[in-house]
Interface confidence: low
């Protein structure tokens, strides 16, 4: 892969260790926490990044109203089980044998159960709504400039194909970015919207995962775009299965 050959580092994932011991002396990088080889020419999967993180010593509007089936990651960090490709395994369990099913971005989509719980397939998250509130500015950002800048960010920094950025909504001070990617749309080599959203989330929090790059400096026509709150909603191809007790809580 294209890990920097001169000093052998992973441009897209600083939570790695690398050495030039791959085929032909090429740079090979492995994720902290798992030791799995990663492709440094693209984003590392969210599952491996979480595993690495856990190893190291949150009116007539044009804004989207999240569906009743939208999930928010309320469970926070956990040490996930990933498959050999670095994807989340459909069933996750903790060390006390409490298990639950997750979607492709690792967010719980069922009630918690015991080891008998079955998760037949990894359900794909095909629609992600990133809801941002920016800090007060002298005036509102120009919507088309904001739209262009955020699309550029996802295209160039996260290498997400432009067709997967479905829309950018703006109603000061709220910005919403919609990412959509069905199973049938995602081709081999395409960045997953879940991985792009996770890198963006970490960037917004000032915890960039990129090697040696400065933090995210997002500007619209030279004006800094500073985010003070982020909420991410995940919509799965198959609705989640929670008990009524949770839904009414």
């Amino acid at each position: 892969h294209t890990a920097a050959q001169d000093n052998c580092t992973c441009p897209t994932n600083k939570m790695t260790v690398c050495s030039p011991d791959g085929p032909g002396g090429r740079c090979q990088c492995r994720a902290l926490g798992s030791g799995m080889a990663v492709d440094c020419s693209t984003l590392t999967s969210k599952c491996l990044l979480l595993k690495a993180r856990m190893s190291a010593p949150k009116n007539a509007r044009t804004l989207v109203r999240p569906s009743e089936h939208a999930l928010v990651d309320n469970d926070g960090l956990y040490d996930p089980d990933c498959d050999p490709e670095g994807r989340f395994k459909a069933r996750q369990c903790n060390q006390t044998s409490v298990c639950w099913c997750v979607n492709s971005v690792g967010v719980r989509r069922t009630d918690k159960g015991d080891l008998s719980l079955r998760c037949d397939e990894l359900v794909r998250t095909h629609h992600i709504l990133i809801d941002l509130r920016h800090r007060p500015t002298a005036g509102a950002f120009n919507h088309s400039d904001l739209d262009a800048e955020l699309r550029r960010l996802f295209r160039e920094r996260y290498r997400l194909h432009p067709k997967f950025v479905a829309a950018v909504h703006y109603e000061q001070p709220t910005i919403q970015i919609e990412l959509r990617q069905n199973t049938s749309q995602k081709a081999a080599g395409d960045v997953d919207i879940g991985d792009a959203a996770y890198y963006f989330e970490r960037d917004i929090k000032g915890e960039s995962l990129f090697q040696g790059r400065g933090g995210l400096d997002l500007r619209v026509r030279g004006e800094p775009l500073q985010v003070e709150r982020t909420l991410i909603y995940y919509l799965d191809e198959i609705p989640p299965k929670f008990s009524m007790k949770r839904l009414t809580a």
């Epitope: 052998c8 260790v17 690398c18 050495s19 030039p20 011991d21 492995r30 902290l32 926490g33 798992s34 030791g35 799995m36 080889a37 595993k51 089980d81 990933c82 498959d83 050999p84 670095g86 369990c93 060390q95």
Partner: antibody
């Protein structure tokens, strides 16, 4: 909690065979590469063998190649080391250790308590 | 095969002293180095992996550094419970060779 428990050690004559086992609990055994490490009395640690998480790859230290076989049964959360043609220099405490996640090469974060193998006539 | 050489083989220091143990690989191994502590009669315990990453639960007085061929384990302030033998190990590829060990005692 996460643990590894070895068994099967004992006294065996040179040239004979022995199989030691390691039962894992508290983690997804089938996701981790597993290793055997040994330590002769009063000596340092010596890596012996590795098996990939899915059993697809094995490797051994030169001194045991052709004599020892590492294997695993993921359905039983168990790691094995079959030792044939045993020699006096194989006398050691044998530890199983957890290695890389979905691989083999990584540091050993969980160790068993060890099982003693003594090769003596 | 890559050889791992530790020095010193033993040392004696006072409580509170800064202790440094070195490990040298005969060929470059990038950051693929781990440090283990083995107390008398006990099982080895992982202290540091990837040359400098502290394993969860390990006191912050332990630190690791280095890359390539030269690595260091430092105990910033030696405590009585640190009496043990310390081993380095490369883990980039087989064989996963250990260093010969450094025995640390209290004066």
């Amino acid at each position: 909690q996460v643990q590894l428990v070895e068994s099967g050690g004992g006294v065996v004559q040179p040239g004979r065979s022995l199989r030691v086992s390691c039962i894992a609990s508290g983690f997804f055994f089938s996701s981790y590469g597993m290793h055997w490490v040994r330590q002769a009395p009063g000596k340092g640690l010596e890596w012996v063998a590795v098996i990939w998480y899915d059993g697809s790859n094995e490797d051994y230290v030169d001194s045991v190649k052709g004599r020892f076989t590492i294997s695993r049964d993921n359905s039983k959360n168990t790691l094995y080391l079959q030792m044939n043609s045993l020699r006096g220099e194989d006398t050691a405490m044998y530890y199983c250790a957890r290695g890389g996640y979905n691989s083999g090469w990584w540091a050993f974060d969980i160790w068993g308590q060890g099982t003693m193998v003594t090769v003596s006539s | 095969d890559i050889q791992m050489t530790q020095s010193p083989s033993s040392l004696s220091a006072s409580v509170g002293d800064r202790v440094t143990i070195t490990c040298r690989a005969s060929q470059g191994i990038s950051h693929f180095l781990a440090w283990y502590q083995q107390k008398p009669g006990k099982v080895p315990k992982l202290l540091i992996y990837a040359a400098s990453t502290l394993q969860s639960g390990v006191p912050s007085r332990f630190s690791g550094s280095g890359s390539g061929t030269d690595f260091t384990l430092t105990i910033s302030s030696l405590q009585p419970e640190d009496v043990a033998t310390y081993y380095c190990q490369k883990f980039n590829s087989a064989p996963l060779t250990f260093g010969g060990g450094t025995k640390v005692e209290i004066k």
